[in-house]
């Protein structure tokens, strides 16, 4: 009685269960009653990452330096190449097909989370008591200077973009 379903890592063809090709190999010929499935290893710069009956291997992803990409992990016959972005850039999508420059946080905003190869800079507004006077992809909001600890007094109040200005205390004559 010909099978209607096959075991895991097999496929049904011509009323026969044939073995799938293992990861890293492609199908050359289906099995017959005389021979098992014929598979061949994927070539250089090719891969297949599952048990399969593919007649062609997939090409490894190309990490195009013109798009700011570089190789994070070299592909094998069983895995695709993983790309990431050059320093100062991050991927525009999960697939990391291109890169954009990390965003800088404007004055009045500080870096909450530094960018990685796959995520952009996260900025946050500087709360009261903190400031940022530069546009930066690394600088956090800095606390205002504490004039009191220096035996000074506030001469000019701080903002989210500027530090306080301290000055000497008025002395009674």
């Amino acid at each position: 009685e010909p099978p209607t379903a096959c075991r895991e890592k097999q496929y049904l063809i011509n009323s026969q269960c044939c073995s799938l090709c293992q990861p890293g190999q492609k199908l050359v010929s289906d099995c017959t009653e005389f021979t098992e499935t014929e598979c061949l290893p994927c070539g250089e710069s090719e891969f297949l990452d599952t048990w399969n009956r593919e007649t062609h291997c997939h090409q490894h992803k190309y990490c195009d330096p013109n798009l700011g990409l570089r190789v994070q992990q070299k592909g094998t016959s069983e895995t695709d190449t993983i790309c990431t972005c050059e320093e100062g850039w991050h991927c525009t999508s999960e697939a990391c097909e291109s890169c954009v420059l990390h965003r800088s946080c404007s004055p009045g905003f500080g870096v909450k989370q530094i960018a990685t190869g796959v995520s952009d800079t996260i900025c946050e507004p500087c709360p009261v008591g903190f400031f940022s006077n530069v546009s930066s992809a690394f600088e956090k909001c800095h606390p205002w200077t504490s004039c009191e600890t220096k035996d000074l007094v506030v001469q000019q109040a701080g903002t989210n973009k500027t530090d306080v200005v301290c000055g000497p205390q008025d002395r009674l004559r």
Partner: antibody
Framework: QVQLVQSGAEVKKPGASVKVSCKAS????????MDWVRQAPGQGLEWMGD????????IYNLKFKGRVTLTVDTSTSTAYMELRSLRSDDTAVYYC??????WGQGTTVTVSS | DIQMTQSPSSLSASVGDRVTITCRAS??????LNWYQQKPGKVPKLLIY???RLHSGVPSRFSGSGSGTDFTLTISSLQPEDVATYYC?????????FGGGTKVEIK
């Protein structure tokens, strides 16, 4: 009925190449792989490789890799086996075989200086 | 490569005898075991495939059995036309390999 008709006997010098043809009839040529098997005088059978006429995908016995090339011409339902850099121990009868069930009549290749 | 070992390498039996040829594979070859008959000066012919399936036109006195690594070809009642060399062959793992052959003669 299935028929595989091979080209005639060949005598070759060491270092030369030989190309054996195998014309198939009586079935759909692209439905079956063509295997090639050889038999040295008084010896057993040795599988050389096979070709899938549907996609021209080839598998070779590593013993022959680099010296043997299998090809097909689907327009004439003909398979070919070329063996290069012939040596005296390549003297044998070469068979084409339709996926290991029906055999050609064999082609005798003699390698001698 | 998988080694296919046949025994005996030759045998002589009388017409009507039951003849058994064994074939042992160096590793598991699943069900992909074929038997061929080659008469003197002739082309090999497929007798049995997938361990026990008779090829079309093969007399029912031929049968195959076994599993994994150990296989048997049996001729239930030897006939004069069965004089030949018999080869087992595995089709499970590349490269496909043949046994060394068993030459069957009539006493």
């Amino acid at each position: 009925q299935v028929q595989l008709v091979q080209s005639g006997a060949e005598v070759k010098k060491p270092g030369a190449s030989v190309k054996v043809s195998c014309k198939a009839s009586g079935y759909t040529f692209t439905d079956y792989n063509m295997d090639w098997v050889r038999q040295a005088p008084g010896q057993g059978l040795e599988w050389m490789g096979d070709i899938n006429p549907k996609n021209a995908g080839t598998i070779y016995n590593l013993k022959f890799k680099g010296r043997v090339t299998l090809t097909v011409d689907t327009s004439t339902s003909t398979a070919y086996m070329e063996l290069r850099s012939l040596r005296s121990d390549d003297t044998a009868v070469y068979y084409c075989v339709r996926r290991l069930d029906y055999w050609g009549q064999g082609t005798t290749v003699t390698v001698s200086s | 490569d998988i080694q296919m070992t046949q025994s005996p390498s030759s045998l002589s039996a009388s017409v009507g005898d039951r003849v058994t040829i064994t074939c042992r594979a160096s590793q598991d070859i699943s069900n992909y075991l074929n038997w061929y008959q080659q008469k003197p000066g002739k082309v090999p012919k497929l007798l049995i495939y997938y361990i026990s399936r008779l090829h079309s036109g093969v007399p029912s006195r031929f049968s195959g059995s076994g599993s994994g690594t150990d296989f048997t070809l049996t001729i239930s009642s030897l006939q004069p036309e069965d004089v030949a060399t018999y080869y087992c062959q595995q089709g499970n793992t590349l490269p496909y390999t043949f046994g060394g052959g068993t030459k069957v003669e009539i006493k």
